[in-house]
Structures are given as structure tokens and as C-alpha cells.
């Protein structure tokens, strides 16, 4: 659910929400990093509807979520990929 | 590189089910956050999207047409597919196949295009 | 569904000229600071090519000539000095809403 995301498109966050999204309305959450033809670290979450919200990455929520799922990921072995 | 390549017969008779498909190459159909589409163009009029399936078979149809359209995907054949039933004069037309640009989702663009197939419904 | 009228519907110009094509919707397609609006160039039996999205950026390939602009509904693509290779015809879409929906053309022909 959590992906780094690399893109040619310049920046895609204009505006960016602090609004809480429910975790079961999330998809995916992409990041983009800070350079990336963008000069800051975006937060892109794709949510089951297929709509895309731009979320400020100091929002407390997202933070939340994103922890968690990197304390997940860190205890899970990895996958192999064919 | 990206292509795409649409085919399917070029004349269908009326009251009858147009199907295209669609080959792909150069990108997955399973992606996240990958769609495909068609979108039409009657002879000397304006484009005209019809439908679109998202990596994970959502479906899009066009309101207008939605009630005779079915889009629908082979992944393991990088290839999608659509039909069109209970045809008429008025859809005779280029069929073009498109993939979207995968950036926002339900509003996105087209930003690789098949090169048309001509459909024309007669008998 | 938001409608897209395009104006002109065709226009004559020469080598050298610039040119502006106008696109309305009938209701905006900006959200959350983006508008949703695309253009697309098409040549006799071809298919379109993607020229500029979200309103003002430009595809990678499409020649500096090429600018757009606008917000909520009302969009202008320029050519700044026409090419010969520009003679074609321009299409409008709005992806903010289902239907995504195209304006009628814009056919640019040779004065």
C-alpha cells in the first residue's frame, strides 16, 4: 500500500489536504520524493474510487499511517520477485 | 516504448455486435494506477470517449452508450477489448484504443494513442 | 455532463503567424488548484497526439511554440509562430468530471 513513486511530471500536488482519509477508502499511498523534478516531497493516496488527493506530509494522520506501515514492511521478509 | 494496436473487422451489419480488441506493448495492464480506453470518431465529426478499465477491471462507460458497451481486459495477452452491441449507421466510425497517463486517476488524460481502426455499420 | 465549445470552429492563417484556439466548459474543471483540461493535436488520418495537460504543461516532444493557459473554464492554446507541420486540427478534453468529454475541433488551415 506504501510506494515511492517516480515520476517525469513535474510537481502534482497544487493544493495539498490535511483532511482525514479513513484507511479503508486508501488504495495506495505514493511518495514522491523531494527532487524528483518537484523541489518537495509529495504525498499522492489513491483512494478506492480511483479519486487522488494530494496530502500535506505533515499531516499527523498520514504520518500515523505511514509509520505504521513502515514498522510492517521492516517485519515482514521480504518477497521475491520474479 | 508505449503502443498501441487496435484490430477487429471492419465492417459490421446493423443491429449486430461491433468487438475490437486492442494489443499492447511497452507497459503492463496489471499496473497500479494503469487504464486503457476507447474513444471514437465519426467520419468529419469530433472525438468521442466511450469507456475506460483501470489494473484492477474497474469499469468508466460513457452514459451515452453504456447501456450497449462492454470494455473488458486480458492481461496474460496485453490486450483489452470492446463491444458494442445493437449497431447502428450512427456507429460507424474510427475506433481508437489510448492509454491513460496513470497520474490522477478519475481525472486523467489520454496520453498514448493506437492508430484507429475504421468500423463501418452496414448491411 | 460539462459541454466543450471550441472557437473558431476553423481558421485560416499563414507560416509565421500566431495563433489562439479558446476552449469553454460549461462548468469548471479546476480542482484542488489543477485544471483538468488537455489538448490535443490531430492530422488527417491519424490519430491525436497529446500536446499539453493540466492546462499549461507541455507534453515531452511538443515544440516551446506550443503554450496553453486558463482556469476554471476558459482555456486558450497558442501557437506562437505556425509551422507548416501545425496545419491540423485541435480537440479540447475535460477529464475533471464523468464523461470525460472533448470540444468539437478546431481546424487550422493554410491561408
Known amino acids: 500500500v506504501l510506494e515511492v513513486y517516480y515520476t517525469h511530471l513535474r510537481c502534482r500536488c497544487v493544493q495539498e489536504s490535511s483532511v482525514f482519509i479513513p484507511r479503508r477508502f486508501i488504495d495506495r499511498i505514493q511518495i514522491s520524493p523531494r527532487g524528483n523534478g518537484c523541489p518537495r516531497k509529495e504525498i499522492i493516496v489513491w483512494k478506492k474510487n480511483k479519486s487522488v488527493v494530494c496530502v500535506d506530509p505533515q499531516a499527523e494522520w498520514i504520518q500515523r499511517i505511514m509509520e505504521m506501515l513502515r514498522k510492517k514492511s521492516s517485519s515482514t521478509p521480504p518477497v521475491p520477485v520474479f | 516504448q508505449v503502443q498501441l494496436q487496435e484490430s477487429g473487422p471492419g465492417l459490421v451489419k446493423p443491429s449486430e455486435t461491433l468487438s475490437l480488441t486492442c494489443t499492447v506493448s511497452?507497459?503492463?495492464?496489471?499496473?497500479?494506477?494503469?487504464?486503457v480506453g476507447w474513444i471514437r470518431q465519426p467520419p468529419g465529426k469530433g472525438l468521442e470517449w466511450i469507456a475506460h478499465?483501470?489494473?484492477?477491471?474497474?469499469?468508466r462507460y460513457n452514459p451515452a452508450l453504456k447501456s450497449r458497451v462492454t470494455i473488458s481486459k486480458d492481461t496474460s495477452k496485453n490486450q483489452f477489448s470492446l463491444k458494442l452491441s445493437s449497431v447502428t449507421a450512427a456507429d460507424t466510425a474510427v475506433y481508437y484504443c489510448?492509454?491513460?497517463?496513470?497520474?490522477?486517476?478519475?481525472?486523467?488524460?489520454?496520453?498514448?494513442w493506437g492508430q484507429g481502426t475504421t468500423v463501418t455499420v452496414s448491411s | 455532463d460539462i459541454q466543450m465549445t471550441q472557437s473558431p470552429s476553423s481558421l485560416s492563417a499563414s507560416v509565421g503567424d500566431r495563433v489562439t484556439i479558446t476552449c469553454r466548459a460549461s462548468?469548471?474543471?479546476?480542482?484542488?488548484?489543477?485544471?483538468?483540461m488537455h489538448w490535443y493535436q490531430q492530422k488527417p488520418g491519424k490519430a491525436p497526439k497529446l500536446l499539453i495537460f493540466?492546462?499549461?504543461d507541455l507534453e515531452s516532444g511538443v515544440p516551446s511554440g506550443f503554450s496553453g493557459s486558463g482556469s476554471r473554464t476558459d482555456f486558450t492554446l497558442t501557437i506562437s509562430s505556425l509551422q507548416p507541420e501545425d496545419f491540423a486540427t485541435y480537440y479540447c478534453q475535460q477529464s475533471n468530471k464523468d464523461p470525460w468529454t472533448f470540444g468539437q475541433g478546431t481546424k487550422l488551415e493554410i491561408k
Open positions: 462548468e469548471s474543471v479546476d480542482n484542488s488548484g489543477i485544471s483538468f
Open positions: 478499465i483501470w489494473w484492477d477491471d474497474d469499469r
Open positions: 493540466r492546462a499549461s
Open positions: 489510448a492509454r491513460i497517463a496513470g497520474y490522477y486517476g478519475s481525472r486523467d488524460w489520454f496520453a498514448y
Open positions: 511497452g507497459f503492463s495492464l496489471s499496473t497500479f494506477g494503469m487504464g
